[in-house]
């Protein structure tokens, strides 16, 4: 039995990956912070009167508050900006765009590449490193909810300018140290991560020093999750590769979830020369699956001596009561032939199903459970 | 923080379609369990189905031949269709998320099943 | 179906005072799907716990879940005036995911 409706024998997996637009953009900024909404016309044609809306009021337009057709702008926003604002056609009130604006008390969140702190030139003829826009660095907490985007800055200058590294508490900090990756804007002096998940919580520092000297800020970042949440997966998990004929090939997804998760390896497959069915959703066999009874669940998906069969698309998917997370991903076989012979580790290898009608299963992945190697699953139940 | 409304007709005859939507706000429907639970005149709560923002669905056995739930992502609205309805189906019917255990519920709305 | 019986039907404690709310399920529940839900006059229920024992956001910590198998608890460690509503449990291990009839609270 699962979530969905009842199992066919062969079915098909809806596309769950590429969400479609969200009808509410959800937006994270620091305090004083410009927040801009951009609400271009739906399909580039007129867009007639519109007006801004925050809250379900009417938005006035100040020296702070700058309202175009399709642009919004508050400068230097605070707490109070939070808020849900919208973009409607003035006559029919119809919704044309709709974000959700939350304003904390921290120096940014979001890669808004603004360049307004970019290096300049002082014009003092040597100095130590010093911050532009101390007064912007003030707040050195700054929490945002799992999945947003986070930017961290430190404005500075100096002459020979300065350069800038950044530290997670208290060690060297690089791209390759966060799944997923950071982008290190030394023109905008600004650290950005992007998805962030509750292992980037931490203490980061950026350091900024020239041959006369070095200054140092740190910030705290805490990422929030409201509980119960739909699973969260790490962001660049699990990650394409590709494997030489005959070689082993391990995948690894990273799943955030405070709701006991159906996890499942799933691979797009060709039934009778398809790889859709009529309705023009793919087919899925269900490699692995099993429930998580811990929030946070590093799993692995082993591939033996692969053969071109395994070749093509995967997919790491968590469900859980409240909703699905899930990731595709792609393995290339090439290189010199081995034997043809494949050793994929699953429990429901070649089980084709309507993967949206399977989406989670409590019932089913109840009852009787093995217990299967910690090294392979990290004390993870195996269906 | 999302917010759900549950809005249609507050009366019914018997043997008509009951037909609610609830409208999600605050967040995308997408990528979330969405269901309808209703609570009895004696308060006994009683889970109807749900769906997926997919469109994929589950019923209660005891109501399936009688429900149909639909939704609308681009209106960021989901529906319930119960049809053939007596005196029995009168209740207070919510809409929430999540496919079983929910974690958000609409204020609820009154249906009332009379000639 | 899995059938849920909560008990005592009424529970009458004072302000200050322990709550142990049972909910016995006709079944065993794989991997602790029991929810609590507290429901106040006129409003929708609200969800305290998921996963037998896990707190929802804002629940405080006076609340808590234990239990496994067929026998579940809620305990309210130190009632608040706010506290004297309706408790209900809910199974979502299995369809169709049913309810108790829940517990009324009432201040003695």
């Known amino acids: 039995e699962s979530l969905g409706t009842e199992q066919r024998v062969v079915g098909r997996v809806a596309e769950v990956s590429g969400p479609e637009p969200s009808q509410q953009e959800q937006l994270v900024f620091g305090s004083g912070d410009a927040v801009e909404l951009s609400c271009p016309p739906p399909g580039g044609g007129p867009m007639g009167p519109t007006v801004w809306v925050k809250d379900g009021a009417g938005l006035v337009p100040s020296e702070r508050v700058l309202v175009g057709p399709q642009r919004l702008q508050v400068l230097n926003a605070s707490h109070e900006d939070s808020g849900a604002y919208s973009c409607r056609q003035r006559l029919t009130q119809l919704v044309l765009c709709h974000f959700s604006v939350r304003v904390t008390d921290a120096p940014s969140s979001g890669d808004d590449e603004d360049g307004e702190d970019e290096a300049e030139d002082t014009g003092v003829d040597t100095g130590a490193p010093y911050w532009t826009r101390p007064e912007r660095m003030d707040k050195k907490l700054l929490a945002v909810p799992a999945a947003n985007t986070v930017r961290f800055r430190c404005p500075a200058a100096g002459n020979p300018t300065p350069s800038i590294s950044w530290l997670k508490n208290g060690k060297e900090f690089r791209g390759e140290h966060r799944i997923g990756g950071i982008k290190l804007r030394h023109q905008q002096w600004s650290l950005v991560m992007e998805s962030v998940v509750p292992s980037d919580r931490g203490n980061y520092t950026c350091v900024v020093e020239n041959k006369f000297g070095s200054i140092r800020q740190t910030y705290t970042l805490d990422v929030l999750e409201r509980s119960p949440h739909r699973p969260i997966l790490q962001a660049g998990l699990p990650a394409n590769q590709t494997a030489v004929l005959g070689s082993d090939v391990e995948f690894h997804c990273k799943v955030y979830s405070d709701a006991q998760p159906h996890i499942q390896w799933l691979k797009h497959v060709e039934v009778n020369g398809s790889k859709v069915g009529p309705d023009g959703t793919p087919y899925v066999t269900v490699l692995k699956s099993w429930i998580s009874e811990s929030v946070e669940a590093d799993v692995r998906l082993r591939l033996a001596n692969v053969s071109e069969r395994d070749g093509g698309e995967y997919l790491c998917r968590a469900t859980n009561f409240i909703g699905v997370a899930e990731k595709a991903f792609w393995l290339s076989v090439h290189g010199p032939r081995a034997a043809e012979e494949e050793l994929v580790e699953a429990d429901e290898a070649g089980s084709v199903y309507a993967g949206e009608q399977k989406l989670i299963s409590e019932e089913d992945l109840g009852g009787e459970q093995k217990l299967i190697s910690e090294e392979d699953l990290h004390h993870h139940h195996h269906h | 923080q999302v917010q759900l409304q549950e809005s249609g007709p507050g009366l019914v005859k018997p043997s008509e379609t009951l037909s609610l939507t609830c409208t999600v706000s605050?967040?995308?429907?997408?990528?979330?369990?969405w269901s309808w639970i209703r609570q009895l005149p004696g308060k006994e709560l009683e889970w109807i189905g749900h769906?997926?923002?997919?469109?994929?669905?589950r019923y209660n056995p005891s109501l399936q031949s009688r429900v149909t739930i639909s939704i609308d992502t681009s209106k960021n609205q989901f529906s319930l269709k119960l049809s053939s309805v007596t005196a029995a189906d009168t209740a207070v019917y919510y809409c929430?998320?999540?496919?079983?255990?929910?974690?958000?519920w609409g204020q609820g709305t009154l249906v009332t099943v009379s000639s | 179906e899995i059938v849920l019986t909560q008990s005592p039907g009424t529970l009458s404690l004072s302000p200050g005072e322990r709550a142990t709310l049972s909910c016995r399920t006709s079944?065993?529940?794989?991997?602790?799907?029991l929810a609590w839900y507290q429901q106040k006059p006129g409003q929708a229920p609200r969800l305290l716990i998921y996963?037998?024992?896990r707190r929802a956001t804002g629940i405080p910590d006076r609340f808590s879940g234990s239990g496994s198998g067929t026998d579940f608890t809620l305990t309210i460690s130190r009632l608040e005036p706010e506290d004297f509503v309706v408790y209900y449990c809910?199974?979502?291990?299995?369809?169709?995911?049913?309810f108790g009839q829940g517990t009324k609270l009432e201040i003695k």
């Open positions: 929430a998320r999540g496919a079983s255990a929910v974690d958000y």
């Open positions: 605050g967040d995308s429907i997408n990528s979330y369990f």
């Open positions: 769906i997926y923002s997919s469109g994929s669905t």
């Open positions: 079944q065993s529940i794989s991997s602790g799907y």
């Open positions: 996963g037998a024992s």
């Open positions: 809910q199974q979502y291990g299995s369809s169709p995911y049913t």
